[in-house]
Amino acid sequence: QSPIFGPQDVSSIEGNSVSITCYYPDTSVNRHTRKYWCRQGANGYCATLISSNGYLSKEYSGRASLINFPENSTFVINIAHLTQEDTGSYKCGLGTTNRGLFFDVSLEVSQVPEFPNDTHVYTKDIGRTVTIECRFKEGNAHSKKSLCKKRGEACEVVIDSTEYVDPSYKDRAILFMKGTSRDIFYVNISHLIPSDAGLYVCQAGEGPSADKNNADLQVLEPEPELLYKDLRSSVTFECDLGREVANDAKYLCRKNKETCDVIINTLGKRDPAFEGRILLTPRDDNGRFSVLITGLRKEDAGHYQCGAHSSGLPQEGWPVQAWQLFVNEESTIPNSRSVVKGVTGGSVAIVCPYNPKESSSLKYWCHWEADENGRCPVLVGTQALVQEGYEGRLALFDQPGSGAYTVILNQLTTQDSGFYWCLTDGDSRWRTTIELQVAEATKKPDLEVTPQNATAVIGETFTISCHYPCKFYSQEKYWCKWSNDGCHILPSHDEGARQSSVSCDQSSQIVSMTLNPVKKEDEGWYWCGVKEGQVYGETTAIYVAVEERTRGSPHINPTDANARAKDAPEEEAMESSVREDENKANLDPRLFADEREIQNAGDQAQENRASGNAGSAGGQSGSSK
């Protein structure tokens, strides 16, 4: 009696796929040992076809996979493009040899069934419409026409030309003739359900002179497409239900006990468990749409179905498409904070992981909006202008090679609360969702800038100070000038010796920035911030206005300004004559196809709906110049 368990008999037809799940006892050794699938030969030898060590036989090349799910103590063998040659005896097992623990599986692959010559085979998916063609001779042109369904020896009338319709086919079956044709009638059966499958006989006339045609109707249940995704990654369900439901409401549901629970539909319904991490995007006018879910959780695994019906809810007899989603807990995507908290007037630094192999990919940050199907307008990107309303308070700092980039948002308000997505134009799996929670501030901010009404005069020296608490003593302080393509750190030099943090004087912790001489282009937003290496912390922002010197205004000697700066022993004076170049560059057209509709160039197309202008500024965010 083997402790391995699986399906003893698997049967399918040529061209299909099978997915065989084998269950093993939950032990540490079993979870990590080799898993295999082998074919039993007449000589008793079991030839490996695929194993978890990476082995793949020639006959399975390009059509099979073996995936271990240690958290479920299962492994799955997927085999596609079946042929009758695949019929045979197999073993799924584990161990370093094929003699270890195993389970015997019999696989039988049949030909697509054939019927007698006079039988027309109709194969349709659930929810679709079939048109059965019935030929007759001229002598029966004026006779009664009918379609019946065989049940054992009997044939029960479905519909006839006297306008009788079987109650179970009411509003679904119609009998008609096309144009002037006098030798053929048709029966349409719409909204097909599994029990419609079977043998039908259409008849024109009565008795021995009647014309009869046999029709075999096969109603196919949707074959779930298997999707294997990593924990914390994203999945896209591409749904193409056909033109006939183009104008009906669309939905995605998840099968649960006796129902299929709607996750999202085009009528505005959305499951709270997917709040902030789901988007439904119409693809075209033919009823195609896609649903993107980010931040996959273990509990997201299961059977999903998309469909269409005016109610936005699943209905029997309406077309559907199905998937089975597996979520693998052995994920390459690092665990990052899903909730970030901030206070009004303060700032947050959000770390966005991305595939380290794609350091040159374009990085984006968008705000998930709940309206209707959900959308995610881009707020900032490595080559995207900062969205209106975020000027001076939002920047993206890329850290090439680190596998992460940082987005800083300051001057927070409670309106900033909500869900945000980190994404790139590269690997579509690396999409992270962050919930930002902004609470009312109960104390003064950690960083304070003086003077708060900053107006600099052209040609003069202007110094602005940033006061920081002792807790930031050991961190790197910086000033940067904000522009549409990031916040470029200004050069700094340390003035005076640092005192030990033990004797830190709370009132004298200041980092200053000096503009000398002030130029018109110095006008704009400046940030004071703290960081430790690549890890960004608190920031605060101030707008520096620049005006012409008015006649009679006192001219400040630059040396006096510097002298002022030297008075504060803990000041780190930063002097800047840096000029920001704002070279405009065109956005990658692959990335913003429909205004700013995010498009994944590698995998699925235009995965989330976004809006805004498509301008851009070149340059690397966050670099010191």
Partner: nanobody, 126 residues
Framework: EVQLVESGGGLVQAGDSLRLSCAAS????????MGWFRQAPGKEREFVAT??????????YYADSVKGRFTISRDNAKNTVYLQMNSLKPEDTAVYYC?????????????????WGQGTLVTVSS
């Protein structure tokens, strides 16, 4: 709501055969598996056999105690599952329950099934 109705139970001699039927009606939209469990007097309900399907592919699972003797099958058009029981033994005596559901996980686990029939008694005398 899905309704399951079992039939075909009865009293037979050891070594005889019996065929159980389970007809499903109602919203079978989310059903991807149907199976049989049994419960002998004073014992826990145990897995017997399950058939799972995906389009035109069928997967049949059996308990070790019935392998080679019992065969599960289904008639898609009739929404009915059958259990053909051959070479019956006295230890096969039990109430046989039909179960149905999405059966995403291990088919031997009772919780994988969302609907249950009332049961049909099979008595095998020696």
């Amino acid at each position: 709501e899905v309704q399951l109705v079992e039939s075909g139970g009865g009293l037979v001699q050891a070594g005889d055969s019996l065929r159980l039927s389970c007809a499903a009606s109602g919203r079978t939209l989310t059903t991807y598996g149907m199976g049989w469990f049994r419960q002998a007097p004073g014992k826990e309900r145990e897995f017997v056999a399950t058939i799972k399907w995906s389009g035109s592919t069928n997967y049949k699972y059996y308990a070790d105690s019935v392998k080679g003797r019992f065969t599960i099958s289904r008639d898609n058009a009739k929404n009915t599952v059958y259990l053909q029981m051959n070479s019956l033994k006295p230890e096969d005596t039990a109430v046989y329950y039909c179960a149905a559901g999405t059966v995403l996980g291990d088919p031997r686990v009772l919780n994988e099934y969302d609907y249950w029939g009332q049961g049909t008694l099979v008595t095998v005398s020696s």
